[in-house]
């Protein structure tokens, strides 16, 4: 970096750093400057954060322009507003068993992460938080015409299915599925879940599915006709293969995506449908998965703001794919 | 962590009582099920019984007038007890975990002869 | 007395698809079984695969998935690997006891 030419700072006031960033001087003594945070690409301009420990590592000396924030032997650890000393082991929560090493934090649960199958005696079987306990446990939810030691009990064994008729358990449940969120990315594979109640035990459960709005390597505004401000749903000219993780979609999909506009409006899916796609892995694994497919696209100017955690109503709904009741338990 | 692990005499009379342990970590029986499966020299697996997680058994009809198994909830122990024992009682023992039989001890090698 | 069946052996090729089944002696295996999947490979513990008719075990790799078929138990692996090659129990509950199938030896070719 040549710091012999005249300082040129890219903004009048000094930027605003996240909470638990530091504000430093750029390596020329110029500008002030967010410092770059462990494992973050830095340069001379663009210094790693002093205060955690951290230098820009620029590996062999053939490369000095670029480097990776490094924290130095011995560096302390700032975490939950708190600082610990390289080798300092701490409790995050009651549920975690944390350590500083070098400026890096690892923790450890300290709850059981076990999972239960059903059986006869917890045929469904579910983790809750119990008051003045840290860590969830398990209890089985179950019919009332259970004995108090297990299943044996040979009155109630006449029914073919054990437990309550579950159309009686459902006769009281007030049905409400929300609709789907928006797709946690604009472009690229994303997640979008919904809340549902439309399972046997009337249960409150979070439904996920994986979504792609638009691929990320297109370039749809290339698209756009002479006059036109939008293009809405951009024919796909070949079908494609999906990526998850390394995987990919055994078969290929005529997928519809959504397109793009011009005038500051944002193309997203109005009318999607839900279908199971199984994706295979390098290692020979297959894993099925629940994914939107789009139906149709609408163009708004109801857009997200960029930091707007809570998206309008009108982008985060998904409508038409209520009918879809894909269970995850 | 779980883990189960069968511990008992290796050698037992004829017409003499099986007295098996089962000790448990990394769960709590009060919370899950434990069963006895034994498994013959080259065969394959014969589930002998259960205690529930609030203390009822259930036991396979072949042994119902000889079996018994209780729990020591304080030391997260589960025992198995067959009386009369014969040779065809010899067995490698197994205890498991209730849901889908998830964890299963190493198993504890039972020879009956006099 | 309740008899359980399983197929003896079975062989696959690596990359194949393969059904167990477990067949009751007293008509259709419906979900209140419990229909349970145990795996032992040579030299090691057993371990459960799946319980309730179709929940894995943490364990348990997406190619194995447990369904009912045709009124029988049923544990299909997807995209076989040379280390499914193990010893497969299933065992069903009859509302005051268990019953294990004979078990199924799988081989898995090359």
């Known amino acids: 970096q040549d710091c012999s030419a005249q300082c040129q700072c890219a903004a009048e006031a000094a930027p605003h750093c996240p909470a638990g960033v530091s504000l430093v001087l750029d390596g020329c003594g110029c500008c002030r400057v967010c410092a770059k945070q462990l494992g973050e690409l830095c340069t001379e301009r663009d210094p790693c954060d002093p205060h955690k420990g951290l230098f820009c590592d620029f590996g062999s000396p053939a490369n000095r322009k670029i480097g990776v924030c490094t924290a130095k032997d011995g560096a302390p650890c700032v975490f939950g507003g708190s600082v610990y000393r390289s080798g300092e082991s701490f409790q995050s929560s009651c549920k975690y068993q944390c350590t500083c090493l070098d400026g890096a934090v690892g923790c450890v649960p300290l709850c059981s992460m076990d999972v239960r199958l059903p059986s006869p005696d917890c045929p469904f079987p579910r983790r809750v938080k119990l008051p003045g306990k840290c860590c969830e446990e398990w209890v089985c939810d179950e019919p009332k015409d259970r004995t108090a030691v297990g299943p044996a009990l040979a009155a109630y064994r006449l029914e073919d299915t054990f437990g309550p008729d579950p159309t009686m358990m459902r006769a009281n449940c007030l049905v409400q599925t929300t609709e789907w969120s928006a797709c946690s990315k604009t472009c690229g594979m994303g997640i979008s879940t919904r809340v549902t109640n439309d399972n046997t035990f009337c249960r409150l459960e979070k439904q996920s599915r994986l979504c792609m709005v638009r691929p990320c390597e297109a370039d749809l505004e290339e698209n756009i006709k002479k006059g036109k401000k939008c293009i809405r749903t951009p024919k796909i000219a070949k079908p494609v293969k999906f990526e998850l993780s390394g995987c990919t979609s055994v078969k290929t999909y005529r997928a519809k995506f959504c397109g793009v506009c011009t005038d500051g409006r944002c193309c997203t899916p109005h009318r999607t449908t839900t279908l199971p796609v199984e994706f295979k892995c390098p290692d020979g694994e297959i894993m099925k998965k629940n994914m939107m497919f789009i139906k149709t696209c609408a163009c708004h100017y109801n857009c997200p703001g960029d930091n707007d955690i809570f998206e309008s109503l009108y982008y985060r709904k998904m409508y038409g794919d209520m009918a879809h009741h894909h269970h995850h338990h | 962590e779980v883990q189960l692990q069968e511990s008992g005499p290796g050698l037992v009379k004829p017409s003499q009582t099986l007295s098996l342990t089962c000790t448990v970590s990394?769960?709590?029986?009060?919370?899950?099920?434990v069963h006895w499966i034994r498994q013959h020299p080259g065969k394959g697996l014969e589930w002998i019984g259960v205690?529930?997680?609030?203390?009822?058994?259930d036991y396979n009809a072949a042994f119902m007038s000889r079996v018994t198994i209780s729990k020591d909830t304080s030391k997260n122990q589960v025992s198995l007890k067959l009386s009369s024992v014969t040779a065809a009682d010899t067995a490698v023992y197994y205890c498991?975990?209730?849901?889908?039989?998830?964890?299963w001890g190493q198993g504890t090698t039972v020879t009956v002869s006099s | 007395e309740t008899v359980v069946t399983q197929e003896p052996s079975l062989t696959v090729s690596p990359g194949g698809t393969v059904t167990l089944t477990c067949r009751s002696s007293?008509?259709?295996?419906?979900?209140?079984?419990?229909a349970n999947w145990v795996q032992q490979k040579p030299g090691q513990a057993f371990r459960g695969l799946i319980g309730?008719?179709?929940n894995r075990a943490p364990w348990t790799p997406a190619r194995f998935s447990g369904s009912l078929l045709g009124g029988k138990a049923a544990l299909t692996l997807s995209g076989v690997q040379p280390e499914d090659e193990a010893e497969y129990y299933c065992?069903?509950?009859?509302?005051?006891?268990?019953?294990f199938g004979g078990g199924t030896k799988l081989t898995v070719l090359g």
């Open positions: 498991a975990r209730d849901g889908g039989f998830d964890y």
């Open positions: 990394g769960f709590s029986i009060s919370t899950f099920g």
């Open positions: 205690i529930w997680r609030r203390g009822g058994t």
């Open positions: 007293i008509g259709a295996v419906t979900t209140s079984n419990y």
């Open positions: 309730g008719t179709s």
């Open positions: 065992a069903l509950w009859y509302s005051t006891h268990y019953v």
